[in-house]
């Protein structure tokens, strides 16, 4: 099939005191090969500070996956979800606390 770029969505949720978990989800993409990782101050975080979901079919002939990391509250703006798919990339910041969703269809 032809390339279908991911829809990328960043959310935040309360973790322990002083920390939040930020999750970056990529969905509705094809082919299944994708890079999804958190960056801090422009540089990718180490593998052991992130948790990844499997790349799974979403039932429409496309795929979905996610990556999450725990960060200090107040430091959100230093973090960006980096997505790379089929030679294209995009970056997705963490929304401020009063809004929990950032949907971006990468072209």
């Amino acid at each position: 099939g032809s390339t279908v770029p991911p829809m990328v969505n960043v959310t935040r949720s309360e973790a322990s005191e002083g920390n939040i978990t930020v999750t970056c989800r990529a969905s509705s993409f094809y082919p299944r090969n994708i890079i999804l990782t958190w960056r801090q101050d422009g540089v990718s975080l180490s593998h052991d500070t992130q948790q990844w979901g499997d790349v799974l079919p979403d039932g429409n002939g496309t795929y979905q996956t996610w990556v999450a990391t725990r960060i200090c509250r107040g430091e959100e703006q230093r973090f960006t979800c980096y997505m790379e798919h089929s030679g294209n990339h995009s970056t997705h910041p963490v929304p401020s606390g009063n809004s929990h969703h950032h949907h971006h269809h990468h072209h």
């Epitope: 960056r39 422009g42 703006q77 990339h89 995009s90 910041p93 971006h104």
Partner: antibody, heavy 117, light 107 residues
Framework: EVQLVQSGAEVKKPGASVKVSCKAS????????IEWVRQAPGQGLEWIGA????????NYNEKFKDRATLTADKSTNTAYLELSSLRSEDTAVYFC??????????WGQGTLVTVSS | DIQMTQSPSSLSASVGDRVTITCRAS??????LAWYQQKPGKSPKLLVY???TLADGVPSRFSGSGSGTDYTLTISSLQPEDFATYFC?????????FGQGTKVEIK
């Protein structure tokens, strides 16, 4: 010290192409995205696109997607912007910049591209 | 695309004056806003990022504030070296967009 040094001024005819270089030093080139921005004479700033020098993956402003090509050479720590099918309105100063998370912290000195018949 | 409307387009002020420049985004940019100073023939210099964080080496007379769609750059006491053009830029989503600039001139 982080430095981005760009190639010199260019004069091109309409319909031609131009390739501007941006040589990085003072940091790990493949760790950070390189962004490209232009500024027409007396005008504001316009984002062209970005490249991951480590992988070569790109992100283009839709306005430039058909005419701009971003590349990077890891062996020389150099990023390139090639703009094709030049027209007079492409006359501008072209800047490269480093993306530090969620802002541009260091900029090249700029390259003036003049398109004139 | 998010449009950035900057005002005023120019202003005349004297050394020692307090100067305020505003930038309004067409949508919520979650404080992902930077301010730059540019002098003729030079590249932009980062002053403020994340709406209110002063970049290294920037004098404390500069300050940024705002959230959501409305942002402000303030120079508390204008100095001779501050006469320049100032731009805002949003980093919430690509294409990253800039305000049209504010030229600060000597009265």
């Amino acid at each position: 010290e982080v430095q981005l040094v760009q190639s010199g001024a260019e004069v091109k005819k309409p319909g031609a192409s131009v390739k501007v270089s941006c040589k990085a030093s003072g940091y790990a080139f493949t760790n950070y995205l390189i962004e490209w921005v232009r500024q027409a004479p007396g005008q504001g700033l316009e984002w062209i696109g970005a490249i991951n020098p480590g992988s070569g993956a790109t992100n283009y402003n839709e306005k430039f997607k058909d005419r701009a090509t971003l590349t990077a050479d890891k062996s020389t720590n150099t990023a390139y912007l090639e703009l094709s099918s030049l027209r007079s309105e492409d006359t501008a100063v072209y800047f490269c910049a480093r993306f530090l998370g969620n802002y541009f912290d260091n900029w090249g000195q700029g390259t003036l591209v003049t398109v004139s018949s | 695309d998010i449009q950035m409307t900057q005002s005023p387009s120019s202003l005349s002020a004297s050394v020692g004056d307090r100067v305020t420049i505003t930038c309004r985004a067409s949508g919520n940019i979650h404080s992902y806003l930077a301010w730059y100073q540019q002098k003729p023939g030079k590249s932009p210099k980062l002053l403020v990022y994340y709406a209110e964080t002063l970049a290294d080496g920037v004098p404390s007379r500069f300050s940024g504030s705002g959230s959501g769609t409305d942002y402000t750059l303030t120079i508390s006491s204008l100095q001779p070296e501050d006469f320049a053009t100032y731009f805002c830029q949003q980093f919430w989503t690509t294409p990253y967009t800039f305000g049209q600039g504010t030229k600060v001139e000597i009265k």
